[in-house]
Interface confidence: low
């Protein structure tokens, strides 16, 4: 069998609200990543599973089952969505992400994906890890990739 | 430690501009907003407006638009105020003050004494 | 804009006392933060502003605990509790939600 790639592209869009009694932030992060079959067969991508951390601690987990299936020498893309909360030790953060005085609200989450893909029986599991600065301050859309470069402005002790 | 200095008075023309100066030290320059705040003779504080030196970013009072220019210059640490077209009313005493990320108003300079001669 | 109203011009007491100044706000200055984003600053005779109190309740570094913030969305307290002679000068509260940052009119605290 010739490989399965999987590319992790990129946060596509960060959706956030706020619970201000909690002093907790509700990130929905979107991701899309692209996954190539370079088989003359079609093989089935079984599952997702995805979380996020900030600083060490894991604040989102996802699993998408039953995904899809891809053919032979074919790409898809797929978004997936890994609902996040910063709270409890990092409520910190609250400040940092929704003060007016702080322009760039970016933050560090490094994201990690399990893609599962079967064919003939046999199942193979690939990963990825990768940092992407995200908007906690406010709903935003990415273009492909762009979450990858931005600068992350680190708030002031 | 943090210092913010102005010079003690300016005398200016009616009609002149004037450019006020404010040197920061004792900290990151870049890492703190700056502000200004104008003070009339025996009357309170007006907020004119405040500027990022890491990017010039400005934000004014609406009052102030059109009479006060903020500017920065990172290589001496130093936050400018420009006021045109000067009146009897620009006569007071400017203040600038930085303030963190956060929210901490936390060091003034000592003030510029402007006042407009006709 | 938000529209910041001190009340009182001034305040009189005798040292040793208790002394409370009053300042509204012409909207809520609660942030979704759950932060309230108003300072207190005293400015004695021929000074500068010092910061006393930041987000409402807070005491500012190197302010006695005399001198303590409280308040709702839109009505705030500067209590100054056991007032001594240096506490003299006038008293204005800021908002800092939103641009434009606005200050109150002020109010003076002279001693009886």
């Known amino acids: 069998p010739r490989s399965i790639d999987v590319k992790y592209i990129g946060v596509k869009s960060a959706y956030v609200s706020y619970d201000v009694q909690k002093r907790t932030i509700y990130l929905n992060i979107t991701n899309t990543l692209n996954i190539t079959n370079n088989n003359y067969y079609s093989v089935e991508v079984e599952n997702i599973t995805a979380q996020v951390q900030f600083s060490k601690t894991v604040i989102g987990k996802a699993r998408l089952n039953n995904i899809t299936i891809i053919g032979p020498l074919d790409m898809k893309q797929i978004d997936y969505t890994v609902p996040t909360v910063i709270a409890e030790e990092m409520s910190y953060m609250y400040d940092f992400c929704t003060l007016i005085s702080i322009k760039v609200h970016n933050i560090v989450l490094m994201m990690q994906v399990t893609v599962t893909t079967t064919y003939f029986g046999h199942s193979e599991q690939i990963s990825q890890e990768r940092y992407q600065y995200v908007d906690c301050g406010r709903n935003t859309t990415y273009q492909l990739g762009q979450s990858e470069y931005l600068n992350v402005l680190q708030p002031q002790q | 430690q943090v210092q913010l200095q102005q010079p003690g008075a300016e005398l200016v023309k009616f009609g002149a501009s004037v450019k006020l100066s404010c040197k920061a030290s004792?900290?990151?320059?870049?890492?703190?907003?700056m502000h200004w705040v104008k003070q009339r003779p025996g009357q309170g504080l007006e907020w004119i407006g405040n500027?990022?030196?890491?990017?010039?970013?400005?934000h004014y009072s609406q009052k102030f638009k059109d009479k006060a220019t903020l500017t920065v210059d990172r290589s001496s640490n130093t936050a400018y105020i420009q006021l045109s077209s000067l009146t009897s009313e620009d006569s007071a005493v400017y203040y600038c003050?930085?303030?963190?990320?956060?929210?901490?108003?936390?060091?003034w300079g000592q003030g510029t004494t402007v006042t407009v001669s006709s | 804009d938000i529209v910041m109203t001190q009340a009182s011009p001034s305040v009189s007491v005798t040292p040793g006392e208790s002394v409370s100044i009053s300042c509204r706000s012409s909207?809520?200055?609660?942030?979704?933060?759950?932060?309230?984003?108003l300072y207190w600053f005293l400015q004695r005779p021929g000074r500068s502003p010092r910061l006393l109190i930041y987000?409402?309740?807070n005491l500012a570094s190197g302010v006695p605990d005399r001198f303590s913030g409280s308040g709702s969305g839109t009505a705030f307290t500067l209590r100054i509790s056991r007032v001594e002679a240096e506490d003299v000068g006038v008293y204005y509260c800021?908002?800092?939600?939103?641009?434009?940052?606005?200050f109150g009119s002020g109010t003076k605290l002279e001693m009886k």
């Open positions: 003050a930085r303030s963190s990320n956060w929210d901490n108003f936390d060091y």
């Open positions: 004792g900290y990151t320059f870049t890492s703190f907003w």
């Open positions: 500027i990022d030196p890491s990017d010039s970013e400005t």
């Open positions: 909207q809520s200055l609660l942030h979704v933060n759950g932060n309230t984003y």
């Open positions: 987000r409402m309740s």
């Open positions: 800021m908002q800092h939600l939103q641009y434009p940052f606005s």
